[in-house]
């Protein structure tokens, strides 16, 4: 399951990517696949928020980012994603590149890193 | 039922380590559902979460900043039951100690907790 | 650090009351919060998690409610054995920081 979430992550960054115009020396921050959720790429300032992850839900190719980000720019119709929900964590898109996510998954979601990958 | 044992002794001298031992019954220290917690209660009633432990394919600590430096929570999975080692005490750590048990629903709770142990830092 | 803050730090109350503690945190934590009980020489014991969800086996007169900053812990008709001290707790972030207390004590 964790491999096709991950294929489907990378289909859904290159499709972001040639929405937003990012290339390899664009700056700001890459999509990428943190082992448990997929996060779209963001530009410097941008705080994108996800929800915690169904570990076992199958990927629908064809859904909407879910996502929501503050700041410059929004992708598609995100679902309207807040800090203030349980189960959302954030990172912000720093000049460094990506912060650690906020709450921890595990203490957001009731797992983390580890348990993905078995 | 889920019971939390503790055990250890109640006087430590300064500079010394505390050492304490939670024993449990009716579940696991090794549950990939549960975390394993230590919390002290100052003689101002005051209460302080001090790190957890727990297991999810690997064994995993966080502990709280103000006694990152000096503490160490290890499990036991032989006899089911988890530590709390606190070294280079001083009579500020004078509290009664707690063990308790983490469980997930919507986040983390601690609903089962030990009895309890004071321990007394004096020379 | 999440700061935790308790109000009032202690009440008087007769039996049949109905009281309300209050529990503000220093930053947003969402409906990250527990609230507990504690009576002398015991351990606190969990009465509401996830701001307002009832722990099972404690009575309905307890209810929680509040997100983001500002929480509440309600006891309607308080009976002789709700004497006692509460603490709510931030299950945020760690480390998992209590509040102050608030002491119930009979008027």
């Known amino acids: 399951i964790f491999k096709k979430e991950q294929a489907m992550c990378l289909e859904k960054i290159q499709r972001a990517n040639e929405l937003m115009g990012f290339n390899d020396s664009s700056p700001g921050c890459p999509g990428m696949w943190d082992n448990i959720t997929c996060w779209k790429p963001a530009h410097v300032g941008e705080m994108v928020l996800v929800s915690c992850p169904e570990l076992f839900r199958i990927f629908n190719p064809d859904q909407v980012w879910e996502t929501e980000t503050i700041g410059e720019s929004d992708f598609g119709d995100s679902n309207s994603l807040d800090l203030s929900d349980m189960g959302v964590v954030s990172r912000n898109c720093t000049e460094d590149g990506w912060s650690e996510p906020f709450p921890h998954y595990f203490d957001a979601c009731g797992f983390d890193e580890y348990e993905s990958e078995t | 039922q889920v019971q939390l044992q503790q055990s250890g002794p109640g006087l430590v001298k300064p500079s010394q380590t505390l050492s304490l031992t939670c024993a449990i019954s009716g579940d696991s220290v090794s549950s990939n559902s549960a975390t394993w917690n230590w919390i002290r209660q100052s003689p101002s009633r005051k209460l302080e979460w001090l790190g957890r432990t727990y297991y999810r394919s690997k064994w995993s600590n966080h502990y709280a900043v103000s006694v990152k430096s000096r503490i160490t929570i290890n499990p036991d999975t032989s006899k089911s039951q988890f530590s709390l080692q606190l070294n280079s005490v001083t009579p500020e750590d004078t509290a009664v100690y707690y063990c308790?048990?983490?469980?997930?629903?919507?986040?983390?709770?601690?609903?089962?907790w030990g009895q309890g142990t004071l321990v007394t830092v004096s020379s | 650090d999440i700061q935790m803050t308790q109000s009032p730090s202690s009440l008087s109350a007769s039996v049949g009351d109905r009281i309300t503690i209050t529990c503000r945190a220093s930053?947003?934590?969402?409906?990250?919060l527990n609230w507990y009980q504690q009576k002398p020489g015991k351990a606190p014991k969990l009465l509401i998690y996830?701001?307002?969800s009832l722990q099972s086996g404690i009575p309905s007169r307890f209810s929680g409610s509040g997100s983001g900053t500002d929480f509440t812990l309600t006891i309607n008709s308080l009976q002789p054995e709700d004497f006692a001290t509460y603490f709510c707790q931030q299950s945020y972030s760690p480390p998992f920081t209590f509040g102050e207390g608030t002491k119930v004590d009979i008027k």
């Open positions: 308790a048990r983490g469980t997930w629903k919507q986040l983390w709770f601690l609903d089962h």
């Open positions: 996830a701001a307002s």
């Open positions: 930053q947003s934590i969402s409906r990250y």
